[in-house]
């Protein structure tokens, strides 16, 4: 059961001094928004018992495992139902306290009633201030039954509930007709899900036999021990003034637990602390009585004396609940009431015993829940005891439950039951989450949901490059912190897996599912400079750039050249895929366009800072080609060219350019300008005799236009070697006349 206690301070002379405190002994209780546990909640539950609104109650947290409710201004504030909720996940548990007004017309003889399934429950409301009206019984706020005012027996109104079932559980109240609800007697009925002494699904399992008023939990078979008692079967008394599953809490104030009501998880309910009784838990137990509400009788034998907190205190030579066992009878010593092991481990369990005659190895045995008996493999004999060691076969889940150590000698026998919890090592259900990445590190959140049992003691993160067969690197981390995987390779995928462990041997769970995390590509930091550019034609631009000289390798995959045509609102991007490149030829540009040009280094998909932008004006494109070019030899050194003007001219032609080249020759061509653009004929002079020439021409407006078709022609005869071609132009008709 969850270690959760709701304390009510019942010194009611002054409501302002009244307080409720909820204390959790759970590991990590109340830590709030972290991954390990929701906070403790303590509140008044107005769903069934409604009281007039007052100033809001004050909630104060004392550390992580205690919360206190104060600020009650008048007695009516106290009446009703209060609840505390604690524990995490499936263990989340609600503890309920029902408060009755001391001045009510009717008072409960007993507030909490815990009964077994099928039992008859009897609720008894004692008349405190008589009214000659009917008594209405309600269940969970709804009408249930009416008793006539003269049906009281010995000043009590009784409600009998035969054959109760778990749905009958809840808050019951008895109220005089037309009286204030605050004058009601409020009860809490808890119906266990099983018959007496049974627990589990189908109620097939036997309870361990809870001592000292402990109540067997119908779901897990554990004893919910009264305040002031501990152990698997509540067999041990705490020191006076202490409570909690391990006696770890202490009652506040100098008078110990006097005046405090203790409420524990169902099916226990509420009671006074050990050694106290009465409606306000202010009366000490009568002689011969002890325990919570003084419900237990000592009946000490052999000279034992009764302590109202712990029961019989035995004289030397005797032990047992009633001092009925002689020390000659063997006795199991210091057996832990609960042990925890991890699944599939093979633990060693020790069991120590003393007695007269002295126990030997063969006289101590260990019995598993399925009845299997284990014999000890080794015994350590000391002057005052024998300790038997048992090697337990590999544990399975079915081994969870009550085990028993038994010692038998000729002096008698003793046995001690203890609970073994077989825990399943945690296995992550999801892969770890990537928080941030850099070129050489990944920041990972390792905390994921898991199957199996907590608490998580360690988190191991295993990682290695994707598709690698190398050993996994492992880092052990704090469960609540993010992890930074360092010294990784840039631009590399890593397979990352989580492994969780819980405390104890064999607590390491299987590895969780892998996830792929890729390191970043570092940002390119270098800003290039555009060092030069020149036009290689109306649509071609050669660009060169430089980078700052920095130590170390260049971080970059290449360069991006951007040309922005502001007039048309168009951007042209040219990718240069070598980081060593420092020049590029841009072709297919729009002639006559003003471009803004810059260059930047790129790495993966990241762009570095751009160079300062440069402004480049491409020359406009020239006119179309001249039409119908024709060549005619005039002599051994002259050839006449004729043509027609280009069509659809964008403006007046400034000149023509003629290209002359010897057919089949390897030398450079010669360009001759025709500076009178209105002419359609020219004579090329100074040519070599009997030589074949190639001619083509183009017009120029602001820029040079397209070339015409190429024509071939040979000079005549065997004249002298000419100095080189020259030209003479005139109108075509005039040339023909000549």
């Amino acid at each position: 059961a969850v270690d959760l206690t709701l304390l009510a301070n019942l010194r009611l002379t002054d409501p302002q001094r009244f307080f409720l405190t909820c204390v959790s002994g759970e590991a990590g209780a109340g830590r709030g928004s972290d991954a390990w546990g929701p906070p403790l909640l303590l509140e008044k539950d107005d769903r069934i018992v409604r009281t007039p609104p007052g100033p809001p109650l004050r909630l104060a947290r004392n550390g992580s495992h205690q919360v206190t409710l104060r600020g009650f201004s008048k007695p009516s504030d106290l009446v009703g139902v209060f609840s505390c909720v604690g524990g995490a996940g499936a263990r989340r548990t609600r503890v309920i306290y029902v408060h009755n007004s001391p001045g009510a017309h009717l008072l409960p003889d007993k507030v909490t009633h815990t009964v077994n399934k099928g039992d008859t429950a009897v609720l008894s409301a004692r008349v405190h201030k008589e009214k000659q009206t009917d008594v209405i019984w309600k269940s969970n706020g709804s009408y249930f039954y009416t008793l006539d005012w003269h049906e009281a027996q010995d000043g009590r109104f009784l409600l009998q509930l035969p054959n109760v079932q778990p749905p009958s559980s809840g808050i019951y109240s008895a109220t005089y007709l037309e009286a204030s609800p605050l004058g009601s007697a409020f009860f809490r009925l808890i119906v266990r899900g099983c018959g007496a002494g049974r627990w589990g699904p189908g109620c097939t399992k036997e309870c361990p036999g809870c001592l000292h008023g402990g109540v067997c939990h119908d779901h897990d078979g554990e004893c919910v021990c009264p305040p002031g008692f501990t152990g698997t079967r509540c067999e041990q008394a705490c020191r006076e003034g202490r409570f909690g599953q391990s006696c770890q809490e202490q009652c506040p104030g100098i008078s110990g637990c006097r005046g405090l009501t203790f409420c524990l998880p169902d099916p226990y309910g509420c009671s006074c602390g050990s050694g106290w009784r009465g409606s306000q838990c202010q009366e000490a137990c009568a002689p011969g009585h002890f325990g919570a509400d003084c419900r237990l009788q000592c009946q000490c034998q052999n000279g034992g004396t009764c302590d109202r907190f712990s029961g019989c205190v035995c004289p030397s030579g005797w032990h047992g609940v009633h001092c009925e066992k002689s020390d000659r009878i063997p006795q199991i010593l210091n057996m832990a009431s609960e042990l925890e092991f991890n699944l599939e481990t093979m633990p060693r369990i020790n069991c120590a015993a003393a007695g007269n005659p002295f126990p030997v190895r063969g006289s101590i045995e260990l019995r598993k829940p399925d009845g299997t008996v284990l014999l000890s493999t080794k015994a350590i004999v000391e002057p005052e005891k024998t300790t038997a060691e048992f090697e337990v076969p590999r544990l399975v889940l079915a081994d969870s439950g009550f085990w028993e150590c038994r010692v038998s000698t000729s002096g008698g026998q003793d046995s001690r039951r203890f609970k073994v919890n077989v825990k399943v090592p945690p296995v992550p259900l999801a892969a770890p989450r990537l928080l941030t990445k850099q070129s050489r590190q990944l920041v990972v959140s390792p905390l994921v949901s898991f199957s199996g049992d907590g608490p998580i003691s360690t988190v191991r993160l295993h990682y290695r490059p994707q598709d690698s067969t190398m050993d996994w690197s492992t880092i052990v981390v704090d469960p609540s912190e993010n992890v930074t995987l360092m010294n990784l390779r840039p631009k590399t995928g890593y397979s990352v897996r989580v492994q969780l462990s819980r405390p104890g041997e064999g607590g390491e769970g299987a590895w969780g599912p892998p996830t792929l995390m890729t390191t970043d590509c570092p940002e390119p930091l270098l800003q290039p400079w555009l060092e030069g550019w020149h036009v290689e034609g109306t649509d071609r631009l050669r660009v060169s750039w430089s980078l700052p000289l920095v130590p170390g390798p260049l971080v970059g995959d290449g360069f991006l050249l951007r040309l922005w045509d502001g007039t048309r609102g168009q951007e042209r991007r040219e990718n240069v895929s070598s980081p060593q490149a420092r020049t590029a030829l841009l072709t297919g540009l729009t002639p006559g366009t003003h471009y803004q040009l810059d260059v930047q280094l790129y790495h993966c998909t990241l762009l570095g800072p751009a160079s300062p932008p440069a402004h480049v004006l491409l020359p406009p494109s020239g006119p179309p080609a001249p039409r119908h070019l024709h060549a005619q030899a005039l002599s051994d050194s002259e050839i006449q060219l004729t043509w027609k003007h280009p069509e659809a001219l964008p403006g007046p032609i400034s000149k023509y350019v003629v290209e002359v080249q010897v057919a089949g020759g390897a030398g450079d061509p010669l360009w001759i300008d025709v500076d009178r653009p209105e002419e359609t004929s020219t004579i090329i002079r100074g040519l070599n005799a009997s030589t074949r020439y190639l001619f083509r021409m183009r017009a120029s407006i602001q820029g040079l236009g397209d070339w015409s078709n190429t024509v071939e022609e040979s000079t005549l005869g065997n004249g002298l070697q000419a100095e080189g071609p020259v030209q003479e132009s005139r109108a075509a008709e005039e040339g023909l006349d000549q």
Partner: antibody
Framework: EVQLLESGGGLVQPGGSLRLSCAAS????????MAWVRQAPGKGLEWVSV????????FYADSVKGRFTISRDNSKNTLYLQMNSLRAEDTAVYYC??????????WGQGTTVTVSS | DIQMTQSPATLSLSPGERATLSCRAS??????LAWYQQKPGQAPRLLIY???NRATGIPARFSGSGSETDFTLTISSLEPEDFAVYYC?????????FGQGTKLEIK
């Protein structure tokens, strides 16, 4: 020791011209970009102009474009700023700075330019 | 142009205290941000480059953080010589632009 030393500042009338110089020493001048940054009296820093290591590329703030010209002589380890058509708002301390790829890592002590009639 | 806005304009602190100066860009500048310190009558000095890298010779009490549009310069424990004006500057886009400065003065 790495050093930059500005000179050429002074008082000039509106519309007039000045030429600032910045002499570099203690480092290989020709492999660094260089910049001019100014600071008007009581005001913050304002970036003015930059030139590439070879001098092949220059860039200017809009406020000085067409009036100022940045240049360098790598053989003399010197940076220049030719300032024409000066205005009252050009009054400032002018700093030259070495541009490494990540920022301006070396600064001169500055030279004062006052434009007033 | 990218606008750089620094806050606060003036920060009054005592030696030994922690100083946090903020710089915001009007659009993303990635991590291309530098911080400069300027004392009266002196030239600026580069402190931090590329948002978080200390320049040569800068004491470890100076640190920078942030990316995209929001950046912080932190001085973990102020020394008397740290009281000055601090400027941020982006190198992501042209023209390069500075913030208007934060004056760190002794309280």
């Amino acid at each position: 020791e790495v050093q930059l030393l500005e000179s050429g500042g002074g008082l000039v009338q509106p519309g007039g011209s000045l030429r600032l110089s910045c002499a570099a020493s203690g480092f290989t001048f020709s492999i660094y970009g260089m910049a001019w940054v100014r600071q008007a009296p009581g005001k913050g820093l304002e970036w003015v102009s930059v030139i590439s290591p070879s001098g092949g590329q220059t860039f200017y703030a809009d406020s000085v474009k067409g009036r100022f010209t940045i240049s360098r002589d790598n053989s003399k380890n010197t940076l220049y700023l030719q300032m024409n058509s000066l205005r009252a708002e050009d009054t400032a301390v002018y700093y030259c700075a070495r541009v490494y790829y990540y920022g301006m890592d070396v600064w001169g002590q500055g030279t004062t330019v006052t434009v007033s009639s | 142009d990218i606008q750089m806005t620094q806050s606060p304009a003036t920060l009054s602190l005592s030696p030994g205290e922690r100083a946090t100066l903020s710089c915001r860009a009007s659009q993303s500048v990635s991590s291309y941000l530098a911080w400069y310190q300027q004392k009266p009558g002196q030239a600026p000095r580069l402190l931090i480059y590329d948002a978080s890298n200390r320049a040569t010779g800068i004491p470890a009490r100076f640190s920078g953080s942030g990316s995209e549009t929001d950046f912080t310069l932190t001085i973990s424990s102020l020394e008397p010589e740290d009281f000055a004006v601090y400027y941020c500057q982006q190198r992501s886009k042209w023209p390069r632009t500075f913030g208007q400065g934060t004056k760190l003065e002794i309280k």
